[in-house]
C-alpha cells in the first residue's frame, strides 16, 4: 500500500545544445516539482545543544512541521521511544507535562515545538554522543519521530554559547516562508511547463562525461500513499547510554509508567527528498518516523499547555512491545 512519486532522472544535455540557460530551465522545474510533491509531508526537527555554562547540561528542542494538531509529544534518549529508548518527558497539549530525571524542565515553546533541559550531574546524566528522540503523535493520523545528537566537534567549553538557530521558529517562519516559496515555486513551475509545451522540446542525449543525475525520490503527500518514511536514526553509542531508570525506582513492584512498546518495525525506505524541510541547526538530525498519514482527521483543536504534573520519581522504562522489529 505504499506508492511513491518517482521524479524521473534528468540527463544533462550535451554542451552546446541549449547552453547553460536551457539546462537551468530544465532542471528548475524538476526541483520545484520535487518541492511541490513533498510540500505536504509532515516532518520533525530536533536540535541538541550542550550548554556552555554547565558542561553536561543539554537543551533539546523539537518541532513538528506538519499541519495536524499534536495529541502528544514524547522525548526519549538512547534511541527512539519504544526501541530501547528511555522516556524523559511526555507533553500533552491540554493536560500538562510529565518528566523524569534527569529532565529538569520540559515546556511548550509554541503549539508545535517543545524544549527540554536536562540536568548535568549524576549517574544518569547524558554525554556528548547520546541520541535524543522526539516523537510527535497526531491522532488518528499516526506519529512522526526524529532523533538527534551533538555533533562530535561540539566543544562548548571552548566555543561561545550556541545561538538558537533560525529553525527554532520553523513552525512559524518555516511554515510561512516555505509555504510562500513553495506556492511561488509551484506557480512558476506551472508557468514554465505551459511555456515548455508551446515550443519544441530539445533533444536530450545521455552525456558521456557526466554521470546520470541521481533519481530524486519524493513522497506524495496523498492519503492514498500512506507512506511510512524511515530514515535510520543515528547509531547509539551504548557506552554512553544511561543505565535504564530502574535505578530510580525506590519502591518495589512494577512502575505504572514502565513500558513502551516499539510502535513499528524500523525499515529504512531509501533516500527521501528533504527539500521542503528547513535545514536544521548544527547538531541536529532530522528524520520522519513511521505513521505518515497525510490526511487530517477530525479532532478538537488543542489549547496551549495546561497544568504541569509532578514527575513520578520512579521514571519510565522502555520495553519492547509486540510491534517490535521483525
Amino acid at each position: 500500500m505504499r506508492t511513491e512519486a518517482q521524479v524521473p532522472a534528468l540527463q544533462p544535455p550535451e554542451p552546446g545544445l541549449e547552453g547553460a540557460m536551457g539546462h537551468r530551465t530544465l532542471v528548475l522545474p524538476w526541483v520545484l516539482l520535487t518541492l511541490c510533491v513533498t510540500a505536504g509531508t509532515p516532518e520533525v526537527w530536533v536540535q541538541v545543544r550542550m550548554e556552555a555554562t554547565e558542561l553536561s547540561s543539554f537543551t533539546i528542542r523539537c518541532g513538528f512541521l506538519g499541519s495536524g494538531s499534536i495529541s502528544l509529544v514524547t522525548v526519549s534518549w538512547g534511541g527512539p521511544n519504544g526501541a530501547g529508548g528511555t522516556t524523559l518527558a511526555v507533553l500533552h497539549p491540554e493536560r500538562g507535562i510529565r518528566q523524569w530525571a534527569p529532565a529538569r524542565q520540559a515546556r511548550w515553546e509554541t503549539q508545535s515545538s517543545i524544549s527540554l533541559i536536562l540536568e548535568g550531574s549524576g549517574a544518569s546524566s547524558p554525554c556528548a554522543n547520546t541520541t535524543f528522540c522526539c516523537k510527535f503523535a497526531s491522532f488518528p493520523e499516526g506519529s512522526w519521530e526524529a532523533c538527534g545528537s551533538l555533533p562530535p566537534s561540539s566543544d562548548p567549553g571552548l566555543s561561545a554559547p550556541p545561538t538558537p538557530a533560525p529553525i527554532l521558529r520553523a513552525d512559524l517562519a518555516g511554515i510561512l516562508g516555505v509555504s510562500g516559496v513553495l506556492l511561488f515555486g509551484c506557480v512558476y513551475l506551472l508557468h514554465l511547463l505551459r511555456r515548455h509545451k508551446h515550443r519544441p522540446a530539445p533533444r536530450l542525449q545521455p552525456s558521456r562525461t557526466s554521470p546520470q543525475a541521481p533519481r530524486a525520490r519524493a513522497w506524495a503527500p496523498s492519503q492514498a500513499s500512506q507512506a511510512a518514511l524511515h530514515v535510520p536514526y543515528a547509531t547509539i553509542n551504548t557506552s554512553c547510554r544511561p543505565a535504564t531508570l530502574d535505578t530510580a525506582h525506590p519502591h518495589g513492584g512494577p512502575s505504572w509508567w514502565a513500558s513502551l512498546p516499539t510502535h513499528a518495525a524500523h525499515r529504512p525506505q531509501g533516500p527521501a527528498a528533504w527539500a521542503s524541510t528547513p535545514i536544521p541547526a548544527r547538531g541536529s538530525f532530522v528524520s520522519v518516523e513511521n505513521g505518515l498519514y497525510a490526511q487530517a482527521g477530525e479532532r478538537p483543536p488543542h489549547t496551549g499547555p495546561g497544568l504541569t504534573l509532578f514527575p513520578d520519581p520512579r521514571g519510565p522504562r522502555a520495553m519492547e512491545g509486540p510491534l517490535g522489529v521483525r
Epitope: 500500500m1 495529541s71 502528544l72 514524547t74 521511544n81 522516556t87 511526555v90 500533552h92 491540554e94 493536560r95 500538562g96 510529565r98 516523537k135 503523535a137 497526531s138 491522532f139 488518528p140 493520523e141 499516526g142 506519529s143 492519503q223 500512506q226 511510512a228 512494577p254 512502575s255 505504572w256 509508567w257 514502565a258 513500558s259 513502551l260 512498546p261 510502535h263 513499528a264 513511521n290 505513521g291 498519514y293 490526511q295 482527521g297 477530525e298 504534573l309 519510565p316 522504562r317 520495553m319 512491545g321 509486540p322 510491534l323
Partner: antibody, heavy 122, light 110 residues
Framework: QVQLVQSGAEVKKPGSSVKVSCKAS????????ISWVRQAPGKGLEWMGQ????????KYAQKFQGRVTIAADEPTSTAYMELGSLRSEDTAIYYC???????????????WGQGTLVTVSS | QSVLTQPPSVSGTPGQKVIISCSGS????????VFWYQQLPGTAPKLLIY???ERPSGVPDRFSGSKSGTSASLAVSGLRSEDEADYYC???????????FGGGTKLTVL
C-alpha cells in the same frame, strides 16, 4: 512482557452497576492508553472507551457516553471500567487492552487482558 | 449492525489461500488505518496486522493486509488448522469519533 490481568466474573442485577479492574504487570503504560472492548456471547467486538493514565484523559464511544466511567489508579498500576444502569444486553466478556492512541496516534490494541465475564440477570 | 462489513464466514483447505474482506466508508477505512485481530476460540483477541499492512513481530508472514479506498482485506496463505479462528477488522471512525470493528469472520479450515 506486559500482562494485563483482569478481575473475576460478575453476576449483576438489571439497573445496578459493575466495576471491572485491569492490573498491569511486567511493565506498563507510560504514554500509552487503556481501552475497554466488550464482546457479547457469539457476537463481535465493541469499543467502549479509553483512558491515558498518565494524564487521566478519557474518550468514550457515543453509545456508552454517560453510562460508562473509565479511571486509572497510578500507584496500583490498575485501570477500571464502571458500567451503570445495567441491562440484560450488557451481558458480555469485557476486555481491557493497551492502546496506542496517544503515543502513536493509532487506534490499535497491542496487549489484551484475559477478559471478565459480566452476566446481567434478574 | 457493525460499521465495518465482513463476510460471516470463509473456509479453505490446508495449504490454500483465503482472503477476508472488510468494507467501510470514507469516514473510517477511507481515511484511517486498518487493523486486523485474530481471536482463537475461548481466548482474547490478538493483534495480527496494524497500519493496513504491517505485521507485529511473531506474526507469520502468511498473514498479509492491504487497503484500497474504503475497503481492506486480510490474506491468509498456506492455511493451517491452527488458523481456524474469528478475524476482526478495525479502524477509527471520524464521524462516530471512536474505534469501530467489523462483525467478524469465522475462518474454517476444512
Amino acid at each position: 512482557q506486559v500482562q494485563l490481568v483482569q478481575s473475576g466474573a460478575e453476576v449483576k442485577k438489571p439497573g445496578s452497576s459493575v466495576k471491572v479492574s485491569c492490573k498491569a504487570s511486567g511493565g506498563t503504560f507510560n504514554n500509552y492508553g487503556i481501552s475497554w472492548v466488550r464482546q457479547a456471547p457469539g457476537k463481535g467486538l465493541e469499543w467502549m472507551g479509553q483512558i491515558i493514565p498518565l494524564f487521566g484523559t478519557t474518550k468514550y464511544a457515543q453509545k456508552f457516553q454517560g453510562r460508562v466511567t473509565i479511571a486509572a489508579d497510578e500507584p496500583t498500576s490498575t485501570a477500571y471500567m464502571e458500567l451503570g444502569s445495567l441491562r440484560s444486553e450488557d451481558t458480555a466478556i469485557y476486555y481491557c487492552a493497551r492502546d496506542r492512541m496517544a503515543a502513536d496516534g493509532m487506534a490499535v490494541f497491542d496487549y489484551w487482558g484475559q477478559g471478565t465475564l459480566v452476566t446481567v440477570s434478574s | 449492525q457493525s460499521v465495518l462489513t465482513q463476510p460471516p464466514s470463509v473456509s479453505g483447505t490446508p495449504g490454500q489461500k483465503v482472503i477476508i474482506s472488510c468494507s467501510g466508508s470514507s469516514s473510517n477505512i477511507g481515511r484511517h488505518f486498518v487493523f486486523w485481530y485474530q481471536q482463537l476460540p475461548g481466548t482474547a483477541p490478538k493483534l495480527l496486522i496494524y497500519k493496513n499492512d504491517e505485521r507485529p513481530s511473531g506474526v507469520p508472514d502468511r498473514f498479509s493486509g492491504s487497503k484500497s479506498g474504503t475497503s481492506a482485506s486480510l490474506a491468509v496463505s498456506g492455511l493451517r488448522s491452527e488458523d481456524e479462528a474469528d478475524y476482526y477488522c478495525s479502524s477509527w471512525d471520524a464521524a462516530l469519533n471512536g474505534v469501530v470493528f467489523g462483525g467478524g469472520t469465522k475462518l474454517t479450515v476444512l
